[in-house]
Amino acid sequence: CDLPQTHSLGNRRALILLGQMGRISPFSCLKDRHDFRIPQEEFDGNQFQKAQAISVLHEMIQQTFNLFSTEDSSAAWEQSLLEKFSTELYQQLNDLEACVIQEVGVEETPLMNEDSILAVRKYFQRITLYLIERKYSPCAWEVVRAEIMRSLSFSTNLQKRLRRKD
């Protein structure tokens, strides 16, 4: 399955939109930094078969979509930017879902992939827990926004490596 070029552009657009979503100066939030323990090895790409990498990408985008689809998220961000961001993520999910169906038919997805997907889910659980502990404060959301920009950048790099493998 070849991810369309529009998918990569969509990821870049999502990053730009997320970059525009900030409402307060991040400089006021330095003391709120937190170690979410991003599972960087899951974005390596070299250790995965293509089907596994696509599944990890799908989980990453799905969890990001879920995080920004909550009521608390709606209250934190400017509505039109949030809607555009969610639309970009939704389109990427559609692209990836088509690929997942196609690739899983070609490759048997081993248990290792379940571990990778679980690692991504636990990462997002840590992010959600942090927001709850910080009572969804503006600075907590700002830290999470920075973290998601970082993880989306890792996703973009993984997609680039996938395209080079084709």
Partner: antibody
Framework: EVQLVQSGAEVKKPGESLKISCKGS????????IGWVRQMPGKGLEWMGI????????AYSPSFQGQVTISADKSISTAYLQWSSLKASDTAMYYC??????????????WGQGTLVTVSS | DIQMTQSPSSLSASVGDRVTITCRAS??????LNWYQQKPGKAPKLLIY???SLQSGVPSRFSGSGSGTDFTLTISSLQPEDFATYYC?????????FGQGTKVEIK
């Protein structure tokens, strides 16, 4: 390879203006903040201020607020430090360094080579 | 502003010695402390971040500890290339502040 390359040494007279630069390469320039640090001859490190190149938001140390201006041009991955009217006491080595912003990652992990500014009549 | 106080301001040691430098913050900074090494005519180099994390490429003889207000940089066995000035820096809040430095000289 991540690099921060600063402009060359400057010799200026009191009252003159100056703008020094710091060009980033080998990484996404807008994903990191750029900080500026002063080191006067034989002295320690002093943090001056910082810029987020993605939107040019800045924060200054109270000691340097109003004395210098920090700016950035993300289209050419370059941050700047400028003075409108130099004083002899501005004579120092100036370093730029990258900062991960709100991400949990090493602070000031890469530094420029420094720009020596000499102000003398 | 958060004041950072290093001690000692200078020390003399021999190759192979265990060296300890301390840094105290004027208020709690959790674990938001970095250590840098600077050699004459060179830019500072990050050694330790978030109080105890070793920066990539830094020898394991360097270690950091502490949280709250009191922090320590330890060099387990001093090497000839370690003679330099060391600075602590808080990254808890703006304005960011450095300690005054500790110069490690050859005995």
């Amino acid at each position: 390879e991540v690099q921060l390359v600063q402009s060359g040494a400057e010799v200026k007279k009191p009252g003159e203006s100056l703008k020094i630069s710091c060009k980033g390469s080998g990484y996404s320039f807008t994903s990191y903040w750029i900080g500026w640090v002063r080191q006067m001859p034989g002295k320690g490190l002093e943090w001056m201020g910082i810029i987020d190149p993605s939107d040019s938001d800045t924060a200054y140390s109270p000691s340097f607020q109003g004395q210098v201006t920090i700016s950035a041009d993300k289209s050419i991955s370059t941050a700047y430090l400028q003075w409108s009217s130099l004083k002899a006491s501005d004579t120092a080595m100036y370093y730029c360094a990258r900062h991960p912003g709100l991400n949990w990652a090493p602070d000031f992990d890469y530094w420029g080579q420094g720009t020596l500014v000499t102000v003398s009549s | 502003d958060i004041q950072m106080t290093q001690s000692p301001s200078s020390l003399s040691a021999s190759v192979g010695d265990r060296v300890t430098i301390t840094c105290r913050a004027s208020q709690s900074i959790d674990g938001s402390l970095n250590w840098y090494q600077q050699k004459p005519g060179k830019a500072p180099k990050l050694l330790i971040y978030f109080a105890s994390s070793l920066q990539s490429g830094v020898p394991s003889r360097f270690s950091g500890s502490g949280s709250g207000t009191d922090f320590t940089l330890t060099i387990s066995s001093l090497q000839p290339e370690d003679f330099a000035t060391y600075y602590c820096q808080q990254s808890y809040d703006f304005p960011l502040t450095f300690g005054q430095g500790t110069k490690v000289e050859i005995k």
